[in-house]
Amino acid sequence: LEETLLNTKLETADLKWVTFPQVDGQWEELSGLDEEQHSVRTYEVCDVQRAPGQAHWLRTGWVPRRGAVHVYATLRFTMLECLSLPRAGRSCKETFTVFYYESDADTATALTPAWMENPYIKVDTVAAEHLTRKRPGAEATGKVNVKTLRLGPLSKAGFYLAFQDQGACMALLSLHLFYKKCAQLTVNLTRFPETVPRELVVPVAGSCVVDAVPAPGPSPSLYCREDGQWAEQPVTGCSCAPGFEAAEGNTKCRACAQGTFKPLSGEGSCQPCPANSHSNTIGSAVCQCRVGYFRARTDPRGAPCTTPPSAPRSVVSRLNGSSLHLEWSAPLESGGREDLTYALRCRECRPGGSCAPCGGDLTFDPGPRDLVEPWVVVRGLRPDFTYTFEVTALNGVSSLATGPVPFEPVNVTTDREVPPAVSDIRVTRSSPSSLSLAWAVPRAPSGAVLDYEVKYHEKGAEGPSSVRFLKTSENRAELRGLKRGASYLVQVRARSEAGYGPFGQEHHSQTQLDESEGWREQLA
């Protein structure tokens, strides 16, 4: 980028540059027209018969340098060929010299600084590439010369440019003084300010554009070269803040539109709000959940909003004595989550009717809560109790919801208690064809024992047809029609009003071999 300090092509009034010395044959200002028919100012000099050592100086007005360290001067000029000038002497030249002088204010006068090299600093002696030829009565023909010179380094507030003619016939058509600067640049959402290079290469710190944040790593910088170009270099740069996305070729951050969001800073564009959420404002980093929908603390900000599940369905119970197997179906509505678990609440009612939460004597397998499978086994049920189980389905947002948790209830009433198993069977007498047995009366918790059932079969005869049953109201029995010298396995169970208790352990007994032994009392 070039910043103009002076351009005579744009000056509409007299330039009125200073000349020295005040003699004939000096530089003179002329006016003309450019291609657009606008007035332009030029200077010309043509003292080809000057006295030896006589120089004609022309000095511009004071030019503030505006922070530039190096200034460029583009000169457009024509130079008359010495051979075209009939009066040209040996002093005719086809070159001129350019100088500059620095000062902190417009302090130069018609006589100061002294018109010589030092205090003036020489920039260059300029030779014409193209010479203009002029024949008497004909128009001058020749190309315009364009030369760009570099001034500096400059350090004071401003400077003057001066031209020294020592015998040329020339016209200075235009002067353009400018400096080069790196234009403001926005790249990777990082703004680098307009920078005037003070050295060959200048590092320039960047700043994030509005609504952008620095990316991790070193702060972004670019290098501004002396030629006004940014040196190509990877830029870590910045990224758009949450709620904003890169736009216009990565030069600005645009707020996410209503109904979209961007949860994190960095690359990526705004996404539509996930299921069951909305954003009513622009620039949303997160979408708000609809009423009744939630995000768990562990859910990502961009996760859909979910709701607690509905109640489990179709609870099936299978009672087996003091054990209960419960099984159910998954809820119709999972709430949109995968982390479904089940939990049970339990109340028990005694036969008398008083109810309370279940006591600690119940055990749940695998447990009363955090169940991932739809079943549970409850053990330790007490007889003749009514149990109410409420099965609930839960997920990661159930704890955020207010209001009652839906459940599926099941009521189970246990049987009254049967007598315990009969053990300690004794053989009181045996013969070759019979066995007399006796046992202790079991302590039945729900009323007296009504009767007993004896189950027996010959050892080794395992089939159902070989098993025989005998009922007795006393706590003894006589088994008849047995084989001589055979072994028998005997089990007994007691019955109360609640029903039969379990068979006790098998008891091993043997009949006599012959009759002569008679009845013999055997003690177990």
Epitope: E29, G32, L33, T42, T132, C169
Partner: antibody, heavy 126, light 108 residues
Framework: QVELVESGGGLVQPGGSLRLSCAAS????????MSWVRQAPGKGLEWVSA????????SYADSVKGRFTISRDNSKNTLYLQMNSLRAEDTAVYYC???????????????????WGQGTLVTVSS | DIELTQPPSVSVAPGQTARISCSGD??????VHWYQQKPGQAPVLVIY???KRPSGIPERFSGSNSGNTATLTISGTQAEDEADYYC???????????FGGGTKLTVL
Amino acid sequence: QVELVESGGGLVQPGGSLRLSCAASGFTFNNAWMSWVRQAPGKGLEWVSAINAKGQFTSYADSVKGRFTISRDNSKNTLYLQMNSLRAEDTAVYYCARKGMSFYNNKYAKSMFDLWGQGTLVTVSS
Amino acid sequence: DIELTQPPSVSVAPGQTARISCSGDNLGKKYVHWYQQKPGQAPVLVIYYDSKRPSGIPERFSGSNSGNTATLTISGTQAEDEADYYCQAWGAGSHQMVFGGGTKLTVL
């Protein structure tokens, strides 16, 4: 001899037309920017119009714009001023004047008038 | 457009210095040229570019220009210098010229 000689002045009725001529000699006319300057009786000088060396550019004072036309014929070394819709206030001596010339570039001229004709009187009256 | 203002008349004794002023806004930033016009004659350029003298013009004629005022100075004024003097500068438009109202110099 370097000189400018105007002609074509005279008495003309308001609304009438007149064409002034200026014959140049003694210098390279086709390298010179030319102007017309007038002077009302007992008054000061008033610049009227200018034309560049090749004749493609012209400029006028607001008081004559649209009524006067400056032109030149470089082959005849002559400058013209065509005056239409003349008014009483156009009564004046009309001078042809040369702008200071460039050494060799007829695209440019100095801002002073370094050569004047003797003038020609234009009288607009009924 | 710039307006150039001159005093209508200036009187000077022979041999004395006559100063004729020409004023206008920031006139010092423009080049001013001076013309002499004697009765019945065409104007003659006497000073150009503020202070330069064309060949053939006597050295007693000089000029200066700064601030808002340009001055034509005739030192050792002679009777033949009695004339009208006009200043001239660039106008605002493209290649438009402006003249001052003129000053009548009377040599007493």
